[in-house]
Amino acid sequence: VPDKTVRWCAVSEHEATKCQSFRDHMKSVIPSDGPSVACVKKASYLDCIRAIAANEADAVTLDAGLVYDAYLAPNNLKPVVAEFYGSKEDPQTFYYAVAVVKKDSGFQMNQLRGKKSCHTGLGRSAGWNIPIGLLYCDLPEPRKPLEKAVANFFSGSCAPCADGTDFPQLCQLCPGCGCSTLNQYFGYSGAFKCLKDGAGDVAFVKHSTIFENLANKADRDQYELLCLDNTRKPVDEYKDCHLAQVPSHTVVARSMGGKEDLIWELLNQAQEHFGKDKSKEFQLFSSPHGKDLLFKDSAHGFLKVPPRMDAKMYLGYEYVTAIRNLREGTCPEAPTDECKPVKWCALSHHERLKCDEWSVNSVGKIECVSAETTEDCIAKIMNGEADAMSLDGGFVYIAGKCGLVPVLAENYNKSDNCEDTPEAGYFAIAVVKKSASDLTWDNLKGKKSCHTAVGRTAGWNIPMGLLYNKINHCRFDEFFSEGCAPGSKKDSSLCKLCMGSGLNLCEPNNKEGYYGYTGAFRCLVEKGDVAFVKHQTVPQNTGGKNPDPWAKNLNEKDYELLCLDGTRKPVEEYANCHLARAPNHAVVTRKDKEACVHKILRQQQHLFGSNVTDCSGNFCLFRSETKDLLFRDDTVCLAKLHDRNTYEKYLGEEYVKAVGNLRKCSTSSLLEACTFRRP
């Protein structure tokens, strides 16, 4: 019988008492085969973290700073359940740390040196740790003691709870630096008042502070937020302009064998029986013998943290950067305006080989990082382990939802002004063998399908989106008799046609021979009835253009396109017979890397782009024997996006809507994780 006990860790007598009450009340409402609570008492949160890591306890609820500690080796804990605040309809699991300024003050985030600062309190998250952590490498050396460095960075501050004797500048704006509400500039409202009164130039608070202190929109409009990219935004655009997004209070567990499903089952049942306004005799979110015992008193309920989400992703790049800077205190030798090498994310060993060659030729400008799937690469870019990669539109959508931005677009047509003219897109098509003359768009049911990969534009999002509109369900593996759609569940019929060996079967990378455009077409040639690819795929792999044994004798005339009106047309008539127009592949990165990725890639394409004529004696960035490694092989240049610099603007309203409709069919664990952080 599996042990269905969750050992909750308590850090005080009062918490232990509440835990025992929790245990007893749960026993009274949950059947004997359901989850139960046991209580483990430790002296501190750090002791609880160690106990969970050592399998002496299973769960504890932590503030963000401690979630970071819990994640660090050797603890390796992960977030499993989040407390939420506000309403069930609009649950808030995060708050945003922001830098508020007066509208007419005219400076940016990178111009804070010499300004006057207002903080909620020394050592507090939004008011100190996050802003000072992010500014850490701009502080004058020596950076220890930290208070001295901060005092020398700003021209004056109010940092309640600081030592006014040792660091008088930190108390210059609020004499005495009182550590309670007796100090008018203490806490969130106090720090905002410090700005409002004109004592300070910037207040470090949380996003709700402005709304709580200024009910009137006209008054709020006198203030702005400083963004990390050195722009400003209105105060209500805090989701796009903040210093960090911080989880409020989170249950953590072991990463391996951590009972996360059991913990969720327990807490979900607990909130049903003892949540807000549920029971008089025991309340989960109430602490008669103290404050915030086990859970925050202000919490309204729990939400399950998506399983794909580790602590780094949950806490977010900015928060992790700030806390790491403060804890480790390491900065680059001398902060320069020069760009660091761009860490390119390569999929599997084939892309890694090409990336390595690029890296050698780039003379220090490009480094390589490997991952097994596109989603793993996106996650690495999010958390700073990698910086950039080029993505199909379907993954540009996921990357965008995860906070990444497009920087340059692949262009596929030769033109005089390639780099300045991003193209409208390419065509997603359905290809069949000419010999299968009875096959049309309307009778694909029961046929064998070949897809570039799940989640990709031409191979999945467009054809499956159109199909979904017809069949109104997501069971595509029942619609086709079998197929190869790399990234599908291994036991799905949509992995049956794939050719990868062993663990590589149906993997969404080049270890699966039927992956990508060329792979999907090969799947059609060898096994399938229909391939969903781009309009250039057939000409690129026929007429001897692909020397691989399977392709070298193929003839374009032996293939036709399926049109949505039920007719068929020759391959060259793609402009009048396609499923939809697809946005070109694009390079994505984090917002903080945008300028450097743009600059370095433009240099790199001038050195190794399509202007290089002899690829046998020179490295060519856009060549890989029809395998589309790192970039599509038909890329002519990487083009500027001009104002299409968000994923929505880049992909266009129509495509975003189409992918949004398919979301109900999505199997993307990363998309689920990212929409948890930003619904």
Epitope: H350, K354, V363, S616, G617, N618, F619, S624, K627
Partner: nanobody, 117 residues
Framework: EVQLVECGGGLVQPGGSLRLSCVAS????????MAWYRQAPGQQRELVAG???????KYADSVKGRFTISRDNAKNTLYLQMNSLKPEDTAVYYC???????????WGQGTQVTVSS
């Protein structure tokens, strides 16, 4: 198609030196990039050092300052001078010229380097 053969490996004590050679069956003068990789048991193959036709070099962080890559186009040979060897340098070392594409598994026999006291 140029064939590459690695040699020069062996057993060496920590702190010792070895010089690996990779001899090509044809001219390497026009080859854009040549590189040394290594693979330890149970590990992925990793780039150790690379050199371009123009002589620009790149090294893995773990070998910087200890290893030197060079090519002699007249002798159609790629070299890897390995100094201050450490136990963690133990692996099979392979050379490549990337000319057979990134897709086929075209690695040669490699040469075993063992660093042990």
């Amino acid at each position: 198609e140029v064939q590459l053969v690695e040699c020069g490996g062996g057993l060496v004590q920590p702190g010792g030196s070895l010089r690996l050679s990779c001899v090509a069956s044809g001219s390497i003068a026009s080859i854009a990039t040549m590189a040394w990789y290594r693979q330890a048991p149970g590990q992925q193959r990793e780039l150790v050092a690379g050199i371009t036709r123009g002589g620009s070099t790149k090294y893995a962080d773990s070998v910087k300052g200890r290893f030197t890559i060079s090519r002699d186009n007249a002798k159609n040979t790629l070299y890897l001078q390995m100094n201050s060897l450490k136990p963690e340098d133990t692996a099979v070392y392979y050379c490549t010229d990337y000319s057979r594409g990134y897709y086929q598994d075209y690695w040669g026999q490699g040469t075993q380097v063992t660093v042990s006291s």
